[in-house]
Each structure stands twice: as structure tokens, then as C-alpha cells.
Interface confidence: low
Amino acid sequence: RSDQEPLYPVQVSSADARLMVFDKTEGTWRLLCSSRSNARVAGLSCEEMGFLRALTHSELDVRTAGANGTSGFFCVDEGRLPHTQRLLEVISVCDCPRGRFLAAICQDCGRRKLPVDRIVGGRDTSLGRWPWQVSLRYDGAHLCGGSLLSGDWVLTAAHCFPERNRVLSRWRVFAGAVAQASPHGLQLGVQAVVYHGGYLPFRDPNSEENSNDIALVHLSSPLPLTEYIQPVCLPAAGQALVDGKICTVTGWGNTQYYGQQAGVLQEARVPIISNDVCNGADFYGNQIKPKMFCAGYPEGGIDACQGDSGGPFVCEDSISRTPRWRLCGIVSWGTGCALAQKPGVYTKVSDFREWIFQAIKTHSEASGMVTQL
């Protein structure tokens, strides 16, 4: 881990699942004192770190489990807990007289389970390399990409669901393969689509404002997690995009603007471009809104394209000690494909963390097309 990438201030131990929070005043790691709100604290901690949810939580005793390099405790203000999305806002140093602290197992994400060392200028990828990538198919034809957040939730772009494509029984989610034609992939139906109510083209077809291009697809049943099917992590709370960082976009979209879709999943490494640069007159001239970002090369040549829409733009980091891939962007729009000074434009996922968590909690039983602001 480089000096530019410090550890995230909330960590979960891979050894015994203890939750640890960094005390920046003291420069030490503290344990979270057990309370009646353990379930909520575990969930919030996992979400803060970029995991989708806590799977289980438990209580450990410092006398038997040991301090393991931590010193002291944080206690949670249970009165303020229901009104926050940030654990760090509701904790303070305390004694924790019982010596019992919180452990949680978060839903794993962003890691390949195989030993593996639409995209213009990209290359074919190999099975298990991007195990969160799915294909969204309407009437059997690939229309959009998507990213698995769990076995049964896929994050994609709102624009993949115009009025003409809203018969949910005709959608399928294809996962676990890199060849569109693979007989080995798994295919599931769709129970619900939750799209962002602030995506203006759905209200006004003439709108050129593409902010909030985000949607969640709830599968009719969960995909089994295998070597080839794994969820991606979300950005951690407060984690900013790093201009110039090279990340990866994947998809089965067109390999040229007027070309055919790729039969095999493509991957391309492209750098993040600052919004200041991307809003320049020679780039997109103020069309890049705060909840979007650009990625690509000023000279063009490598980019996402039609059919990659909704697919993942992922960046790897080690802020959770273990290297993990995080879904930083969703392929949204662009002028042409791989043109000079017209990079791909992506939905900035970090700005929709709360929208995602809220949608999943609120609409897990919903059916059909659902909108959420």
C-alpha cells in the first residue's frame, strides 16, 4: 500500500472479524464496545467500508480474544445512531467496563476467487477476471452491462430501461461467463428494477441532462457465488476519485462506434480525468455534472461504447488491507466512442452510496419498475 493510500479508518479483522476504528487524535486503533445496537453498528460499519451489508455479527471478550494491537474502546451514541450514515460521527472514547466488543462478517466483495494475474481498444478478458460483470439481455439480446453487488442485486444505468424495455419478464441477467454465447453462464429473471427518480430523460425525453443515470436490478432469485460470479465492492464512505488513477472498464459493447458487439467480454484500462479538464471547451464544455466523471485518454483510442452502458468501471485499492476492486463508475454516456477529447462519461457511484443502501432496504420485496429519488 502506497503512502498516498492510507488505511480506511474503519477495518474488520480477517482473523476474527473484530471491528476496529482509528482514533486519529491518539493515532491508535480502538475496538467498538458492544451495545444493544450491535446489529445496526455492524451494518453501518460494513457499509462504510464499501461492503453491501453485514452478514452476521457477534460479541467477543477482550480478556479471551485479546487486544491484538488495539488500545481501548469507542462507544456508540445509541440516541444519534438512527440519524446518521457515518459511524465516525456517533462514537466517542469510553471505558467499556464489560470488555465486550463487536465483531462482524461483512459480505465479501471485490476479490477474484481465481489465481488470475464493449470496449474500444480493449482486449478479450478471461473467465473469473471480472466476476461481477453481468450482461442484461432483453428478448435474448445483450443491451447493457451491470455489476453484481450481491447474489441478487445488480447495479446498472437507468437509461437501460426506457419505456420500450420495461416488460420485466423479457429481461434476463447473464452471469458467470465471458463469452456472450457461452453455454456455461447462468441466466436469471428479474423481479424488480429500481431506477433513480432524478434521471430527467425519463420525465422529459428532450432532456440532455444525464445526471442520476443509475438503477438497481433485483433478480428473481440469488445467483450462486462461484469462482466466476462474485460481487464488487462499493466505494468506501468519503472515498474520493483520484484524478489520473488508471482503472478498468469492461463490457460486451461495440468494439467500434459503427461496429458489432464483442462476443467476448472486453477490458480496457483508462485513467480518470478531472471534471475541470473534462468540462473544458475542447472536451465536454460544462456537460459534466458533479455526480458524473470522465475517464479515458485525451487522444482517444480506448473507451467504452454502445452496449457497455450500465457496466462497471472498477478501481483497485488496499484501503481495507486486502486489495479489493471497487465500483467507482457506471458506463453512462459519451460522444462517439474513443474519439479524441471525448472520453467516456460515468455515473459517480460514490455519490449514490446512500441511494443504493436505501433502495435495497426499501424495495427488496418490490416487483416491477420502481422509482426512488
Partner: antibody
Framework: QVQLQQSGPELVKPGASVKVSCKAS????????INWVKQRTGQGLEWIGE????????YSNEKFKGKATLTTDKSSNTAYMQVSSLTSEDSAVYFC???????????WGQGTSVTVSS | ENVLTQSPAIMSASPGEKVTMTCSAS?????MHWYQQKSSTSPKLWIY???KLASGVPGRFSGSGSGNSYSLTIRSMEAEDVATYFC?????????FGGGTKLEIK
Amino acid sequence: QVQLQQSGPELVKPGASVKVSCKASGYTFTDFVINWVKQRTGQGLEWIGEIYPRSNSIYSNEKFKGKATLTTDKSSNTAYMQVSSLTSEDSAVYFCARGSGDYAMDYWGQGTSVTVSS
Amino acid sequence: ENVLTQSPAIMSASPGEKVTMTCSASSSVTYMHWYQQKSSTSPKLWIYDTSKLASGVPGRFSGSGSGNSYSLTIRSMEAEDVATYFCFQGSGFPLTFGGGTKLEIK
């Protein structure tokens, strides 16, 4: 190896129902859809519908809605198709077939002959 | 419903002869699949994703096409190729089969 073993031939009276079974082995039953296909003597193939055992989600050919009912029993790795209100038009060989990710049916049962006769 | 029309309905070829049969779709499809069925047996997946040979299929078979028009070709007819061949599309519901091409040997 992947195998789909179907139940034996049936001779049934008009107006009755018949339930054909398809026992899967050699793969994870819940990971693939099971399709059902009809073939009348000397005729072509007709897709009846498919069922995904993991969730029991079903996609059916409108033509067979109300005629064929698809179910599965995950504990025995078996798919079933019940055909009701039988007429001579339902006399056919019925196949189950495993559906792979791209809709191609890669493994087929041996077929079950259903004859409707009074 | 996407109607698949196969032609010819029946054809015969001499051993060693090149054979081509076609399948026309009323609506464009992403991929076409082909099945071989011999009398009184189950169909077998023969060609999938338009051009890929299923396991155990001899290399003299090939498939091609796009959009609405697809074909299956046998480079050099052999006696064991006598069968009925069905095209099949899975690009839209309901899934549909062609009426079949019955291939006989002269």
C-alpha cells in the same frame, strides 16, 4: 456425465391429465433451466416453456398456458410437466432439455410418449 | 413469434457431396442453433451460437449467417449424416424451432 431421465410412456383417456417427470443427474440441478419441448409424430419441435429450479421462475409459450404446468422438486433433482384436459392433439413425445446460458438446449431427455385415446 | 422457415424441407445428397440447408427468421436473431435428430431418438445440439460445433460433431459440419438468414453446411456428405436438422432461436420469446430439413442419402 449429464443425464436427463424421463418417465415412461403413457396411455391416457381424453379429458384426463398426465404428469411427466425428468430426473437430472451429473450437474447442479438448480444452476440450469429445464425446457420442455413437444414433438408430434412426424412433425417438428415446439417449445412449451422453461422453469428455473433455483427460483421456480417460469417462462411459457402462450400457446401452452393453461395446458401445461411446470414444477420442480429440488430435493430429488426432478422437473415435472403436467398436461391437463388431454385431447388427441396432445398425443406426442414430450422432451425435457437442459437450457444453457444462451438458451441453447445442450442435453435432452430420451422423451416420453403420451398417447390420448379412449 | 419469430417464425423460422427451413429450406428445403427434404433433400438428398450423394456421399462426398456438399450439402447446404438454410433457415430464415421472420425477425432478426442474435444467434442461431442447430439440432440433429435421427429417427426415434432425442434431438442433439449440433451447432450452437451460429457457428460453433457441439462436442463430438465432425469437422465437416459448419454453420454461418447473421440477422435473418442462417445456414448449415456439410462439406462432404456421409451416410451417418442422414437425419432431420432443426434450426432454433433463443433470442426472443417464445423460443422457436424451424420445421426441419430431412436429409437423405442417394
